[in-house]
C-alpha cells in the first residue's frame, strides 16, 4: 500500500528551525530507516508531497498555511500531516486536520494552546513546548524556595511571530499552575530605548527573580542599563530564556559561552553585569546517536537541498520531526497489525501518546495529551573565566533537576536571592517600619 | 527525612581494594553532587572526592587520584568508590556527603561513616 | 591546593561564654565557605554555609562573618551542648579543603 505525508513547512525561508532544507533531510533518514527496517510497514511505500506555510515574502502566514493543508487534502488524501511549525500557522491547520480526523505531527507549534486536545485533536507535538518550560522553572522555583514572585518580560519585534509573548503565556501560564505564586509580566519593545528605562523603573518594585525573553543583543543592553541602575547586585537574578542558544554560540555573534562578550567597549561592564544572569535553554541531547545523525542530516541537507546547516540547538528540531515520523510509522505499522487501517487516525494517534521511544534526540516519551516532555539546560557564569556552561539539566520524563557541574552555581551572595525583599516590595513589611521608626526616636 | 548509609568498609592489607557504597534516600538524588569525605582516627577531616548527578564530572584530592575511583548508579540512588592500591594512610572513616550546588549548601548531609583499616 | 589555617586549635570556655574562632584560607575564595561541629564518635553537622548563611535547624547564638580570606565563627552564650570541635572548609575550588579544626573544651 502507499502512506501519504502531506508537508506543510517554509519551502523557501531557510532561517525557521522547521524550514523544509533542515526538515527535509531528517525525513529522507527517518524514510530510509523504515525502508531498511522489516519490522516496519513492511510491504509499503511512503511518500511525501508539499505544500508551503509561508506567503510570497517567505514569512509564516495564516493564510497560506490552510489554503497549502486543503489543497493537499483534497488532491492526494494524506494519512498525516507533518508541520507546520510557526504558532499562527499551526494553529488553523491544526483545527482542519482534527476535523477530518487526519493526524497532525509536528516539533513545532510550541504555543501553550496547541496543547488543548478538544480543539487540537489528534496533533503531536514531537518537539519542545513552552508550557513544559514552565514544569521546569517550577521545578527550580521549589528548590530554591522561590514560591511568592516573578517578573517576566518578553521583546517584542515586528515580524518574529511573537515568539517570546508566546513562550512566556507558556511559562506564565504553567508556572501559575504549579505554585500559589504572583507573576507579573511585561512586554518591551526590542528598538525602542525608552521602554527598557520603563522596565528598569518597574522592576524594583515587581520582582527578584527576572525572567527576559529577547534577542542576546536586547538582553545584554537589558543588562547593562540594570548594572548602571544599581540591580545587577546580589539581590536580582535575571533568566534569560534563550531556548535555542543563540547568545551563546560563536560565528558571527559574541565568542562562544561568552554572551556578554562583543568587542565594543562595555565588555568589562557587561561581563560584571552577567553575573547576575543565569540562561535556559533547550538540553543539547548528548547521546552517541544524535551526532551520528547530525553528521548525516548536515551531508544531506548539503547534498540534496544545497543548504549549510549550521551548529547549534536549532537541529534538534529537525531530529524532533525524524523521531516523531518513525514513532507515527511504528504507531501506523502497530495499528495495520491490529486489523486497522491507515486512515484510523484516532487509533494511530492514541498508540503514538503516553508512550516512550528511543530516537536519534535520545529518550523521548510522549506524555498523555501527545506532547513531548522536554529537557532543558540551565547555563551559569564561572566567575574565573567569563565563560557560561551547563550547571544543571532538567529531565522532561522524571521531571528532576539534574546536578551537572560538580560546582555550585555563581550566586553573588554565596546562596540565592529571595524571590521578595527583605522588607516587601514596598517596604510595607511592619518588622522594618518599626526598626525605621525606633531610630527615629 | 534525607539519608545515608555507608557500606563495605573493613580491614584490607596494603595494596589491596575494597568497594565502598552509600545507599541514599528521602531526597532527588540526581539532583546533588555527591561526595566521599574521610577522618583518620584522632586527625581533621579530609574531603576526597566527588561526582556530579549527571555522572559528567568528577573531583579527587591529590593524595587519592589514580586510586580512588568515584562512580553513581542513579536508577539504585547509590554512591560508591572504588579504593585500589590501599595504603596505611588510607585508614579513615569514610562518610558519604551531599552537595547541593543549585543553593550552596555544602555538606549539609552526611552518612555515619564507614571504617577502612589498612593494615598487614 | 587552597591552604586552611584555623586558629586557635583549641580553647577552653565556661557556659555562657562569648568564643570567636577565625579561618584564613591562603587565596581569596569570596564567600564559598562554611562551617561544621562534630562531636566525639558522630558525623560533622553543617552550621554555616556560605561564610554567614545559617543553617536551617541551628540556633542563632551561632554565627559567621568574613569573606575574601578572613572568616570568623562566633557563638554567643556558649552552651553545654557547643563543647565540640569546629571545622571551616572552602568550596571555592577543588579540591575542596578542611581547616585543621578547633577543639572547644569546658574551661
Known amino acids: 500500500g502507499n502512506l501519504t505525508v502531506a508537508v506543510v513547512l517554509p519551502l523557501a525561508n531557510t532561517s525557521y528551525p522547521w524550514s523544509w532544507a533542515r526538515v527535509g533531510p531528517a525525513v529522507e533518514l527517518a524514510l530510509a530507516q523504515v525502508k531498511a527496517r522489516p519490522d516496519l510497514l513492511p510491504g509499503w511505500t511512503v511518500r511525501t508531497v508539499l505544500g508551503s506555510s509561508e506567503n510570497a515574502l517567505g514569512v509564516c502566514s495564516d493564510t497560506a498555511a490552510p489554503l497549502a493543508a486543503v489543497d493537499l487534502k483534497w488532491e492526494h488524501n494524506p494519512a498525516v500531516f507533518l508541520g507546520p511549525g510557526c504558532v499562527y500557522a499551526a494553529a488553523p491547520v491544526g483545527r482542519f486536520t482534527a476535523h477530518w480526523r487526519v493526524p497532525l505531527l509536528t516539533a513545532g507549534a510550541p504555543a501553550l494552546g496547541f496543547g488543548v486536545k478538544d480543539e487540537y485533536a489528534l496533533t503531536t507535538r514531537a518537539g519542545p513546548s513552552y508550557a513544559k518550560l514552565g514544569d521546569f522553572v517550577a521545578a527550580l522555583h521549589r528548590r530554591l524556595g522561590w514560591e511568592r514572585q516573578a517578573l517576566m518580560l518578553y521583546a517584542y519585534r515586528p515580524g518574529d511571530e511573537e515568539h517570546c509573548f508566546f513562550l512566556v503565556e507558556g511559562l506564565f501560564m504553567r508556572v501559575r499552575d504549579r505554585l500559589n505564586i504572583t507573576v507579573d509580566h511585561l512586554e518591551f519593545a526590542e528598538d525602542d530605548l525608552s521602554h527598557y528605562t520603563r522596565l528598569l523603573r518597574t522592576m524594583p518594585r515587581k520582582g527578584r527573580v527576572i525572567y527576559i525573553c529577547s534577542s542576546p543583543d536586547a538582553f545584554r543592553t537589558l543588562m547593562l542599563l540594570a548594572l548602571e541602575a544599581g540591580l545587577c547586585g546580589e539581590d536580582y537574578v535575571f533568566f534569560h530564556l534563550d531556548i535555542f542558544g543563540q547568545s551563546l554560540q560563536g560565528g558571527q555573534g559574541p565568542a562562544p559561552r561568552r554572551p556578554w562578550e562583543r568587542g565594543d567597549g562595555q565588555d568589562v561592564s557587561a561581563r560584571q553585569a552577567f553575573q547576575a544572569a543565569k540562561i535556559i535553554t533547550y538540553k543539547d541531547p548528548d547521546n552517541p546517536e544524535y551526532l551520528e545523525f547530525l553528521k548525516q542530516l548536515k551531508h544531506l541537507a548539503y547534498e540534496q537541498f544545497n543548504f549549510t546547516m549550521e551548529d547549534g540547538l536549532v537541529n534538534t528540531i529537525p531530529a524532533s520531526f525524524h523521531d516523531g515520523l518513525l514513532l507515527y510509522i511504528q504507531a501506523v505499522t502497530e495499528t495495520l497489525a491490529h486489523g486497522g487501517t491507515v486512515t484510523d487516525g484516532e487509533n494511530i494517534t492514541q498508540r503514538m501518546w503516553n508512550r516512550s521511544f528511543q530516537g536519534v534526540t535520545g529518550y523521548l516519551k510522549i506524555d498523555s495529551s501527545g506532547d513531548r516532555e522536554t529537557d532543558f539546560s540551565l547555563w551559569d557564569m564561572d566567575p574565573e573565566n567569563g565563560a557560561f556552561r551547563v550547571v544543571l539539566n532538567y529531565n522532561g520524563t522524571s521531571q528532576e533537576l539534574v546536578a551537572v557541574s560538580g560546582r555550585k552555581l555563581n550566586w553573588p551572595l554565596g546562596y540565592p536571592p529571595p524571590d521578595i525583599p527583605k522588607c516587601g516590595f514596598d517596604n510595607e513589611d511592619p518588622a522594618c517600619n518599626q526598626d525605621h521608626l525606633s531610630t527615629l526616636e | 527525612e534525607v539519608q545515608l548509609v555507608e557500606s563495605g568498609g573493613g580491614l584490607v592489607q596494603p595494596g589491596g581494594s575494597l568497594r565502598l557504597s552509600c545507599a541514599a534516600s528521602g531526597f532527588s538524588f540526581v539532583s546533588y553532587v555527591m561526595g566521599w569525605v574521610r577522618q583518620a582516627p584522632g586527625k581533621g577531616l579530609e574531603w576526597v572526592s566527588s561526582?556530579?548527578?549527571?555522572?559528567?564530572?568528577?573531583y579527587y584530592a591529590d593524595p587519592v587520584k589514580g586510586r580512588f575511583t568515584i562512580s553513581r548508579d542513579n536508577s539504585k540512588n547509590t554512591l560508591y568508590l572504588q579504593m585500589n592500591s590501599l595504603r596505611a594512610e588510607d585508614t579513615a572513616a569514610y562518610y558519604c556527603?551531599?552537595?547541593?550546588?543549585?543553593?550552596?549548601?555544602?555538606?549539609?548531609?552526611w552518612g555515619q561513616g564507614t571504617l577502612v583499616t589498612v593494615s598487614s | 591546593a587552597i591552604q586552611m589555617t584555623q586558629s586557635p586549635s583549641s580553647l577552653s570556655a565556661s557556659v555562657g561564654d562569648r568564643v570567636t574562632i577565625t579561618c584564613r584560607s591562603s587565596?581569596?575564595?569570596?564567600?564559598?565557605f562554611g562551617w561544621y561541629q562534630q562531636k566525639p564518635g558522630k558525623a560533622p553537622k553543617l552550621l554555616i554555609y556560605a561564610a554567614s548563611r545559617l543553617q536551617s535547624g541551628v540556633p542563632s547564638r551561632f554565627s559567621g562573618s568574613g569573606s575574601g580570606t578572613d572568616f570568623t565563627l562566633t557563638i554567643n552564650n556558649l552552651q553545654p551542648e557547643d563543647f565540640a570541635t569546629y571545622y571551616c572548609l572552602q568550596d571555592y575550588t577543588y579540591p575542596f579543603t578542611f581547616g585543621p579544626g578547633t577543639k572547644v573544651d569546658i574551661k
Open positions: 587565596q581569596g575564595i569570596r564567600n564559598d
Open positions: 561526582i556530579s548527578g549527571s555522572l559528567t564530572n568528577t
Open positions: 556527603v551531599t552537595y547541593d550546588i543549585l543553593t550552596g549548601h555544602l555538606f549539609d548531609y
